[in-house]
């Protein structure tokens, strides 16, 4: 028998520095977690103690904090090189700055293989990107070899900006021939490393003959055996064992997100490469693990540029951006409109001639807007200003909901109207009319939504049984502010870009902004 230790991360999303327990900005250092300096300490400790160790990342290193906004992926390559990652799979967010934003800072600079078997380049890009990412890589580990085959969510064209010269194939269809190729090369220990979410990870384990272990990402799935060490609630045991169609036991793992945990999986293979045992758990990277001093010093050096960036002008406003709770928790506010417009703009993807865009709607809890921006400061808007408006370090995510769920959400928006509560929704691509004289749960009298399958966008009545795509804060997708119906009834959820980054990119693109209150939210006569 031969033992392999797999250390793994996924969905780190730019958390190079240590964070608070909820993965937002670190405030009290003695209670902070994660970060690459602490990760390196633990990785080195395990490398010293155990003979056959692989350090793998399952994608979405890109996007999530000011580190990515400023360094655009150079920070990912630099610090992953420093930690000596053995391989990485491409995630959807690796394409957020287009293919060039992946090639130059990361693919050309990484000293480790970057993998995806189901992304195929065509046209002029094919020769430009050739060899910069691979379908698989065979890695020597001790006296053995291990094959790593990569995969990426086929939804990436809807979630990011991969352009028109990359084709995202079905994961299982694309993986099988690559695994077969590894088998013909006499590689009998194969890890599928990828970024398509836990459900697809399990399907890969079940369907792809020859895959021994699946290391996944995208769904931020927390698996744990025993009593979990922090706030995350396990979605299942670690590892999650899937019985494949050909009768093998395939461990499937994921390590939550944001670098809070280091996945730790020990696998025992027999002489034919069959997995015969597996055990482990994610390791919570809390303050009991010291930050490595040399990596920490490097982080501090790179940090300087971030502090300078946050006070630079992104663009200008020529109107007052009303982000006050007195407005945003009671009525349509122009800060809410600005944010929703930015959210839709960030999700423009012309992937189908029948649709002007795949999504037209945005909802945003008024309580998530924490500050106004005064235009009387020469109109200047900085990252620092936006951080005051959106201080929670959330993401703007894409969900699919039935019309009936949206109707419930809008009823919830005003079920206790007038108490300055955060659930009052700001909107984009939606016209809503409330009648507050009616009883809670029956106050939405009109709900029209902007069409997507149209050449000239117009507002049509919401259909209860239709499935709609909506952009919203991750806070709402997770049922925050009482929106349990969203969490319980959503049909799909893909995490998106950092909230501040979305708005800052929009403002930089527009240069001058002047959002208005324009009748997106109305109250029928006699009730308000």
């Amino acid at each position: 028998a031969w033992e392999l230790t797999i250390l793994h991360t996924n969905d780190v999303h730019s958390r190079l520095e240590q964070t608070s327990e909820d993965s937002s900005k670190c405030v009290n250092a003695s209670r902070c977690m994660g970060g690459v300096a602490r990760l390196f300490t633990k990785v080195q400790q395990i490398r010293r103690a155990e003979p056959n160790v692989l350090l793998l990342d399952a994608g979405d290193q890109y996007q999530g904090t000011i580190w990515f906004t400023v360094y655009k992926g150079a920070e990912v390559a630099h610090f992953m090189n420093a930690l000596r990652y053995d391989a990485m799979a491409l995630g959807n967010h690796e394409f957020d700055n287009g293919v060039e934003g992946l090639i130059e800072p990361l693919l050309k600079e990484a000293k480790f293989p970057i993998l995806s078997a189901n992304i195929k380049a065509k046209g002029p890009l094919a020769s430009q990107i050739s060899g910069l990412y691979l379908p698989y890589k065979v890695l020597p580990v001790g006296d053995e070899v291990v094959g790593i085959v990569g995969y990426t969510s086929k939804e990436t064209p809807f979630l990011s900006n991969p352009g028109t010269n990359l084709v995202f194939e079905d994961e299982i269809t694309a993986l099988q021939p690559e695994v077969d190729k590894l088998k013909t090369l006499n590689v009998n220990k194969i890890i599928a490393l990828g970024h398509s979410g836990f459900e697809m990870d399990k399907l890969i384990a079940q369907k792809v003959r020859g895959v021994d272990v699946v290391v996944g990402g995208h769904s931020n799935t927390f698996l744990y055996t025993g009593n979990p060490p922090s706030k995350e609630v396990p979605a299942g045991k670690y590892p999650f064992i899937v019985t494949s169609d050909d009768g093998r036991k395939v461990p499937v793992v994921q390590a939550y997100a944001f670098g809070k945990y280091l996945g730790y999986l020990k696998i025992e293979f027999d002489e034919r490469g069959n997995v015969i045992s597996s055990h482990g758990n994610p390791i919570l990277l809390n303050s009991s693990i010291p930050e490595d001093p040399s990596i920490k010093a490097d982080i501090n050096k790179w940090r300087i540029k971030l502090d300078n960036y946050s006070t630079q002008e992104l663009g200008k406003t020529i109107v007052y951006l009303d982000g006050s709770s007195q407005s945003c928790r009671f009525r349509e506010c122009n800060m809410g409109n600005l944010i929703c417009d930015a959210m839709i703009n960030n999700n423009l993807r012309h992937t189908d001639e029948m649709f002007w865009n795949h999504v037209s709607m945005c909802i945003l809890n008024g309580g998530g807007i924490r500050s106004p921006i005064d235009e009387r400061n020469n109109g200047t808007i900085t990252w620092e200003n936006l951080a005051a408006v959106l201080p929670f370090g959330g993401t703007f995510d894409l969900v699919q909901l039935k019309g009936s769920t949206l109707k419930k959400a809008f009823e919830h928006s005003v079920h206790r109207y007038g108490q300055s509560t955060g659930e009052f929704l700001q909107v984009g691509g939606i016209h809503v009319v409330y009648d507050l004289s009616r009883k809670p749960g029956d106050r939405v009298v009109k709900l029209d939504v902007l069409c997507t399958k149209c050449r000239v966008p117009s507002y049509d009545p919401l259909k209860m049984d239709e499935v709609y795509k909506v952009i919203l804060p991750n806070f709402l997708a997770n049922g925050g502010d009482g929106f349990q119906m969203i969490k319980d009834e959503l049909l799909r959820h893909d995490s998106g870009d950092q909230d501040i980054n979305v708005v800052s990119t929009y403002i930089s693109k527009m240069k001058v902004i002047y959002p208005a209150v324009e009748g997106r939210i109305k109250f029928s006569t006699g009730s308000h």
């Epitope: 028998a1 033992e3 055996t225 025993g226 009593n227 045991k237 999650f240 064992i241 899937v242 019985t243 050909d246 009768g247 093998r248 036991k249 730790y264 020990k266 025992e268 027999d270 034919r272 069959n274 015969i276 045992s277 597996s278 055990h279 482990g280 758990n281």
Partner: antibody, heavy 119, light 107 residues
Framework: EVQLVESGGGLVQPGGSLRLSCAAS????????MHWVRQAPGKGLVWVSR????????GYADSVKGRFTISRDNAKNTLYLQMNSLRAEDTAVYYC????????????WGQGTLVTVSS | AIQLTQSPSSLSASVGDRVTITCRAS??????LAWYQQKPGKAPKLLIY???SLESGVPSRFSGSGSGTDFTLTISSLQPEDFATYYC?????????FGQGTKVEIK
């Protein structure tokens, strides 16, 4: 109801051979990994051998390697243990055990069959 | 091979007592540990898997805890049918190994 019934035990002389069987019922035998575990009189449990669901991979404790052979017939829902070159120290109750499909532990055991190696 | 050391090797207790049995592994095994109960002349019966998960149908007075190298089986209130021998077993690697057993006898 899951049932595992061992048979084939008995008295055998040192150097002799014996073939144990374990008849499985109440579950899809061909989907499960199976094991043999033994227990010498008055002693603790000792793992002996393992076979995966399709029979393509097997494993043995060092003490029986080269002498014992585990096999299965999925069409007959039966697990076997062929024991050759038996020694006095192989005297024990032999249990077959089913490994849980989504884990690595034994969730069901048979009642055991006694093997006595003595001259 | 990973060695498992159970303690005590035997204990005497009365009905209603709280009983604790420990199992120490010679190296870290995460939560890859099971506990079995065996009565004389009978097959072992699974009580606890993954160190702390209760097998269905097993009374809730049985509980398991621990991870890494140190594990505990607890019977919160001993019942007459609980007098038996208890074994821990690791399933983190081959060969699968068992503790030497703890015999729980009537005081």
């Amino acid at each position: 109801e899951v049932q595992l019934v061992e048979s084939g035990g008995g008295l055998v002389q040192p150097g002799g051979s014996l073939r144990l069987s374990c008849a499985a019922s109440g579950f899809t035998f061909s989907s499960y990994w199976m094991h043999w575990v033994r227990q010498a009189p008055g002693k603790g449990l000792v793992w002996v051998s393992r076979i995966i669901s399709d029979g393509s991979s097997t494993g043995y404790a060092d003490s029986v390697k080269g002498r014992f052979t585990i096999s299965r017939d999925n069409a007959k829902n039966t697990l076997y243990l062929q024991m050759n070159s038996l020694r006095a120290e192989d005297t024990a109750v032999y249990y077959c055990a089913r490994e849980f499909s989504s884990g690595w532990y034994f969730d069901y055991w048979g009642q055991g069959t006694l093997v006595t190696v003595s001259s | 091979a990973i060695q498992l050391t159970q303690s005590p090797s035997s204990l005497s207790a009365s009905v209603g007592d709280r009983v604790t049995i420990t199992c120490r592994a010679s190296q870290g095994i995460s939560s890859a540990l099971a506990w079995y109960q065996q009565k004389p002349g009978k097959a072992p019966k699974l009580l606890i898997y993954d160190a702390s998960s209760l097998e269905s149908g097993v009374p809730s007075r049985f509980s398991g805890s621990g991870s890494g190298t140190d594990f505990t089986l607890t019977i919160s209130s001993l019942q007459p049918e609980d007098f038996a021998t208890y074994y821990c077993q690791q399933f983190s690697s081959y060969p699968r190994t068992f503790g030497q057993g703890t015999k729980v006898e009537i005081k």
